[in-house]
Amino acid sequence: ECRPGMICATSATNSCARCVPYPICAAETVTKPQDMAEKDTTFEAPPLGTQPDCNPTPENGEAPASTSPTQSLLVDSQASKTLPIPTSAPVALSSTGK
C-alpha cells in the first residue's frame, strides 16, 4: 500500500508496482495574521505541494518501485489559478474490491 499522500499509478492485480505523490492537494483556508488585517481577511488555496498530504518527493511510497521509466503526473494549466474552496467534505467510499 502507498503511504498517505501517495497514489498507486501502476498496479498489478493485488499490489502496487509504483506509488507517486497524489497530484491534487486539497484546498484549505489560509487566513492572514490578525495583526496584518482585521477585516480584510482573505482565503486562498495553498500552492501545490505545500501540504503534508501532497508529498512532492517522487517514488517514496512503501510499494516497490518499478524498474521501468516512470510517467510523471502533470499539472494542467488550471492549477496555477487561485481556486475556490470546496464546500463539500471528503467522502469516504467503500468498495467490495477485487
Epitope: 502507498c2 498507486c8 498496479s11 492485480t13 493485488n14 497524489y22 510499494a63 467510499l93 468498495s95
Partner: nanobody, 122 residues
C-alpha cells in the same frame, strides 16, 4: 456500495476520438475526486487522469494534450475525452471514486464498474 458504470468506448482508427462517460450512483458525487485508470491486455492497471471536486485536472504525460477530463456533478457523471488516439491507447478504461482514499492500496481497475473497451487500430 458505490456503483459506477463506464460507457462510450468503441473501435476507432488512429487519430480518432471518443468520449467516455462514468456515471455514479449511491454516493454524493460532488464530494470526492474522480480518476480514470486503464488496463491493456497483459499489462498493469495504470492511472490516466484525475479531476478534483473543484475542477482541477491532472494527466499522465502519455495522454497530456490529447485527453481531457471533466465532470458534471448535477448528472453524477465524469467524462474523459480521448483525442488523437493511438494504438497504444487500446485498453479497458475504468473510473474510480475518491482515488486519494481508494487507490493507495493498489489495484484500481474494475473495482466499481465493468469498464469500457477502447480499441485503436492503425
Amino acid at each position: 456500495e458505490v456503483q459506477l458504470v463506464e460507457s462510450g468506448g468503441g473501435s476507432v482508427q488512429a487519430g480518432g476520438s471518443l468520449r467516455l462517460s462514468c456515471t455514479a450512483s449511491r454516493f454524493t458525487f460532488d464530494g470526492p475526486d474522480m480518476a480514470w485508470y486503464r488496463q491493456a491486455p497483459g499489462n498493469a492497471c495504470e492511472l490516466v487522469s484525475i479531476i478534483s471536486a473543484d475542477g482541477r485536472t491532472y494527466y499522465t504525460d502519455s495522454v497530456k494534450g490529447r485527453f481531457t477530463i471533466s465532470r458534471d456533478n448535477a448528472k453524477n457523471t465524469v467524462f474523459l475525452y480521448l483525442n488523437s488516439l493511438q494504438p497504444e491507447d487500446t485498453a479497458v478504461y475504468y473510473c474510480a471514486p475518491d482515488p486519494r482514499r481508494n487507490c493507495r492500496g493498489g489495484y484500481c481497475c474494475g473495482n466499481w464498474g465493468p469498464g469500457t473497451q477502447v480499441t485503436v487500430s492503425s
